[in-house]
């Protein structure tokens, strides 16, 4: 008789999840010499320990503490790029501008990017059928708590000028409920961070509006200013040209506004 299993609203754990995490860890530590000493089996043990045998709606940041510890990574604190609702362009940017880092360029972000996982209370099984959805089921699920925890630590580590890439095509360019708006903004350390510079990425080719005047950007400016951090904003009217100019800054067409 098959055992009764909780049916959640979200997709189940990504197939071959343990193998994927371990393989990603090995690949990352081979490519990044500063993390070469990290023992990927211990990293997997810590990852597994955060959610296996635990109720998938009752996960805490402390559950992930061992994993966070093993994944501790020093990135240049003045070279951090945050993003909200525009992951692909942010990643394309750091692939070209190799001295800047998104969360997914760190070991822990790389391990979990685009993956889903959850377990079941009191069993050592991974649930490949379904996992809790943030809205429909619960917010304290393994995936959401993981990203909240790593995002908090990533923001806490930032210094000097921090950049954030925002999607100008969305109705809320700055969304207080996004990970950036609810976690990262509030964990930038005013004693270390001087300025938050927003890059608002335009979607339409003919869109010449100044999206830095958008009410949600003004809201972001207000939140940041109240935290004694300066705020600046730039429109990126042509993201394709922007990337091209990052690749080839000497190009004559790169002196004009992008």
């Amino acid at each position: 008789v098959p055992r009764w299993r909780q049916q959640w609203s979200g997709p189940g754990t990504t197939k071959r999840f343990p193998e994927t995490v371990l393989a990603r860890c090995v690949k990352y530590t081979e490519i990044h010499p500063e993390m070469r000493h990290v023992d990927c089996q211990s990293v997997w043990d810590a990852f597994k320990g955060a959610f296996i045998s635990k109720h998938p709606c009752n996960i805490t940041e402390e559950d992930y503490q061992p994993l966070m510890k093993l994944g501790t990574q020093t990135v240049p604190c003045n070279k951090i790029l945050l993003w909200s609702r525009i992951k692909d362009l942010a990643h394309q940017f750091t692939q070209v501008q190799r001295d800047m880092f998104t969360l997914e360029d760190t070991l822990l972000g790389y391990l979990a990017d685009d993956l889903t996982w959850c377990g079941e209370f009191n069993t050592s099984k991974i649930n490949y059928q379904s996992c809790p959805d943030w809205r429909k089921d619960c917010s304290n699920n393994p995936v959401s708590v993981f990203w909240k925890t790593v995002s908090r630590r990533f923001a806490e580590a930032a210094c000097d000028v921090v950049h954030v890439m925002l999607n100008g095509s969305r109705s809320k360019i700055f969304d207080k409920n996004s990970t950036f708006g609810s976690v990262e903004v509030h964990n930038l350390q005013p004693e270390k961070v001087q300025t938050l510079e927003a890059w608002v990425i335009h979607g339409g080719r003919e869109d010449s509006r100044d999206l830095c005047q958008d009410p949600t950007i003004k809201e972001l400016e207000s939140i940041i200013s109240k935290r004694n951090i300066q705020f600046s904003c730039k429109n990126i009217y042509r993201p394709d040209k922007f990337l091209q100019c990052v690749k080839n800054p000497e190009d004559s067409s790169c002196t004009s506004e992008i």
Epitope: V38, S42, D45, A46, K48, G49, E62, L70, Q73, T74
Partner: antibody
Framework: SLEESGGDLVKPGASLTLTCTAS????????ICWIRQAPGKGLEWVAC????????KYYANWAKGRFTVSKTSSTTVTLQMTSLTGADTATYFC???????????????WGPGTLVTVSS | AQVLTQTPSSVSAAVGGTVTINCQCS????????LAWYQHKPGQPPKLLMY???NLASGVPSRFKGSGSGSQFTLTIGEVQSDDAATYYC??????????FGGGTEVVVR
Amino acid sequence: SLEESGGDLVKPGASLTLTCTASGFSFNNYWICWIRQAPGKGLEWVACIYSPSGDIKYYANWAKGRFTVSKTSSTTVTLQMTSLTGADTATYFCARELSGSSYEGYFESWGPGTLVTVSS
Amino acid sequence: AQVLTQTPSSVSAAVGGTVTINCQCSQSVYGHNWLAWYQHKPGQPPKLLMYRASNLASGVPSRFKGSGSGSQFTLTIGEVQSDDAATYYCQGYYNGGSYAFGGGTEVVVR
């Protein structure tokens, strides 16, 4: 508090197991690490373990392979050392890390240490 | 491997004076400020003084001050007392949760 035991005078090539015993708290939700200090030298980190359910452990590069950290009960952690050489002569401390993710990376509580001497 | 260089290796101070100990890290510590200071007296376990570069550990007098960020840190002991005679160590926190200690600074109080 923490207390180390098992330090001894041993010959090169020998093995030795040190024990760290807690009183007044259990190891279950703390990182416990081993740190050593050679005579007249500075402190050197060896290994750490965290054991809420399954053991999570990691080591300094130089300690991998020869040293093994284990939790043997909720109040005892051991450090097994093999193929000992004169360079391993040191006072070995166990230490408890500050709890909470904002405080990791520091040792709030140390044992008095146990002396290991490797000599023929 | 990370190297933490403490200077001076030994310092003598009069009671009521000030002592400054520097810790230079070969690589920036995690989070730019993940550095601790310990006081170690002979026959006793080391005692945590400061964490996150400038935060005083519980029960430590405010005469102890920590500063610095990245790879350069300083411990200052103001109004030195005879009880402050000890060896002081800095300790950084690094990639993969690894730790590295400085070589120590002996403080002699005269």
